[in-house]
């Protein structure tokens, strides 16, 4: 085959080699860029910057080699469009530093930086950590800082990510309140900071204020949906990024729903309870307190991480006709009480009018009028019966 006269020539089915001296000063408009998985660049003294726009359209790129060239600066977001990049060789260039942001989000199996005039500073603390932790083949390169000795010996005591403190209100927060959060940022070389509010949606009206080193956030007219939602403050410096998440507890009264009993490995009376703080629960059976046992007990489902509502069952492991009756769930927190009732019939009485039947659990009378509070919507409360042959 005739030698390729171009600056860049195909190499294999999806590779490109650019080795003709001084032919490139940027990576724009590389031929067949969208399908490239491998790009090898050498002897390009005029290629001094690598930026976001240079690698746009190289979404399939896995291996990138730029060696023996004039690379001085790699932008922090240079590899944003090459998420599959796994091998990066930038050896024998003019790089003095490389931001931690440049490699963030990539799963690099190999990073080669030998032969660069690196300048030891906190900005290379991340690279020193890679060396310590044996990542990306960095330890084998025994990287040196220009005129300063091995990277491994760089003092790092003062090289910390920012420190964040988020102040939340001590007092109880009620629905409709305005809440002011403040994020205090400390540390050297602070670059950027902000709030992540993706979980909030319709939970409040958001107003940001202030800037480094003190960021303010007002959550106006909060709703109960704000509970269990993360409000995150973040800050970055040349060493790395720090995040702190807080949650604002918005108080609201207890509510409860009961549903028709279902047979699920024995029996379950399903319920849902909500409220902040989490309400305490009590069951009544035919108006008397039901003391829970290993055969009649409350069992909660795994809670969703981002909501206050809890779902569960009153488990009746072996109900018979003596368990037929009216079940009431009482829920209470400092902001209100609620109750819901349902009739359940598990089995016909095979010993009709038999006074010998034991009471299955210990009961104590309760003043049911004490469960005052707003009425709660009750669903599926039609009584039902199931006949089961005994024996």
């Amino acid at each position: 085959a005739a030698p390729c006269p171009d600056a860049c020539c195909p190499h294999g089915s999806s590779g490109l080699r650019c080795t003709r001296d001084g032919a490139l000063d940027s990576l724009h408009h590389l031929p067949g860029a969208e399908n490239l998985t491998e790009l090898y660049i050498e002897n390009q003294q005029h290629l001094q910057h690598l930026e976001l726009r240079d690698l746009r359209g190289l979404g399939e790129l896995r291996n990138l080699t730029i060696v023996k060239s004039g690379l001085r600066f790699v932008a922090p977001d240079a590899f944003h469009f090459t998420p599959r990049l796994s091998r990066l060789n930038l050896s024998f260039n003019a790089l003095e530093s490389l931001s931690w942001k440049t490699v963030q989000g990539l799963s690099l199996q190999e990073l080669v930086l030998s032969g660069n005039p690196l300048h030891c500073s906190c900005a290379l603390r991340w690279l020193q950590r890679w060396e310590e932790e044996g990542l990306g083949g960095v330890p084998e390169q025994k990287l040196q800082c220009h005129g300063q000795g091995p990277l491994a010996h760089m003092p790092n005591a003062s090289c910390g990510v920012p420190t964040l403190k988020v102040q939340v209100p001590n007092a109880s927060v009620d629905v409709g309140d305005d809440v002011l959060l403040r994020c205090q940022v400390e540390g050297r070389g602070l670059e950027q900071a902000g709030w992540i509010l993706t979980e909030l949606e319709q939970s409040a009206t958001v107003m940001k204020s202030g800037g480094l080193p003190s960021l303010g956030l007002t959550l106006a007219n909060v709703t109960s949906d704000l509970n269990r939602k993360n409000v995150t403050c973040w800050a970055e410096n040349d060493v790395g990024r720090a995040e702190v998440s807080v949650q604002v507890n918005v108080s609201f009264p207890a509510s409860v729903q009961l549903h028709t009993a279902v047979e699920m490995h024995h029996w379950c009376i399903p319920f849902s309870v909500d409220g902040q703080p989490a309400p305490s629960l009590r069951w009544l059976f035919n108006g008397s307190v039901l003391n829970e046992t290993s055969f009649i007990f409350t069992e909660f489902l795994e809670p969703a991480a981002n909501e206050t509502v809890r779902h569960g069952c009153l488990r009746l492991n072996q109900p018979t006709h003596v368990n037929n009756g009216n079940y009431t769930l009482l829920a209470a927190n400092p902001f209100g009480q609620a109750s819901a009732s349902i009739m359940a019939a598990f089995m016909d009485n095979p010993f009709e009018f038999n006074p010998e039947d034991p009471i299955p659990v210990s009961f104590s009378p309760v003043d049911t009028n004490s469960t005052s509070g707003d009425p709660v919507e009750k669903k599926d409360e039609t009584p039902f019966g199931v006949s089961v042959a005994v024996g």
């Epitope: 024995h266 072996q318 089995m347 039947d357 034991p358």
Partner: antibody, heavy 117, light 106 residues
Framework: QVQLVQSGAEVKKPGASVKVSCKSS????????MHWVRQAPGQGLEWMGE????????NYNEKFKNRVTMTVDISISTAYMELSRLRSDDTAVYYC??????????WGQGTTVTVSS | DVQLTQSPSSLSASVGDRVTITCSAS?????MHWYQQKPGKAPKRLIY???KLASGVPSRFSGSGSGTDYTLTISSLQPEDFATYFC?????????FGQGTRLEIK
């Protein structure tokens, strides 16, 4: 697999207390009730009480109510049964057993407690 | 308390025999459960919810009954079946066991 491993044999004097442990593994400790059952030499099984690790709810057999205390440490998936003011007729093998939807599915190997002056 | 009375208290039988143990409750219970215990060992769940076989239990074991009267049947005794059997109720506190039926080789 599910295992309930109990603490070793104890010899106690009358009037003393004994605390037996039952370490669970192989299942979610907080989802199951733990029962304590004892068996005197050559005798039948006697239920002492039960505890629900999820909320530390306990039910005791009235016979032992003033002398028995059942507790759990969910951080190490362990249940405890302490019996105080021991008498010679408390000499027995003490078992833990777990239940959720069915009774006493799995049992510990037993802990022999001897009360003797 | 619900008292459970097993009969017989002890029983001699031969390999291959059909054996029946009964458990009578002082008041109605919804279900009965049965355990097998061998000397020096913890009890092992045999039958639960009156008639369900616990995992790994041979089909020669069966249970039946309702109300106050329940039965454990072994259709054809095997050498490993010689042990003590207990019934138990799980319907009211305190949970109670029968006094046991000792099954020995004739």
């Amino acid at each position: 697999q599910v295992q309930l491993v109990q603490s070793g044999a104890e010899v106690k004097k009358p009037g003393a207390s004994v605390k037996v442990s039952c370490k669970s593994s192989g299942y979610t400790f907080t989802n199951y009730w733990m029962h304590w059952v004892r068996q005197a030499p050559g005798q039948g099984l006697e239920w002492m009480g039960e505890i629900y690790p999820n909320n530390a709810r306990v039910n005791y057999n009235e016979k032992f109510k003033n002398r028995v205390t059942m507790t759990v440490d969910i951080s190490i998936s362990t249940a405890y049964m302490e019996l105080s003011r021991l008498r010679s007729d408390d000499t027995a093998v003490y078992y833990c057993a777990r239940s959720r939807y069915d009774p006493m599915e799995d049992w510990g190997q037993g802990t022999t407690v001897t009360v003797s002056s | 308390d619900v008292q459970l009375t097993q009969s017989p208290s002890s029983l001699s039988a031969s390999v291959g025999d059909r054996v029946t143990i009964t458990c009578s409750a002082s008041s109605s219970v919804g279900y009965m459960h049965w355990y097998q215990q061998k000397p020096g060992k913890a009890p092992k769940r045999l039958i639960y919810d009156t008639s369900k076989l616990a995992s790994g239990v041979p089909s020669r074991f069966s249970g039946s009954g309702s109300g106050t009267d329940y039965t454990l049947t072994i259709s054809s005794l095997q050498p490993e079946d010689f042990a003590t059997y207990f019934c138990q109720q799980w319907s009211s506190i305190p949970l109670t066991f029968g006094q046991g039926t000792r099954l020995e080789i004739k």
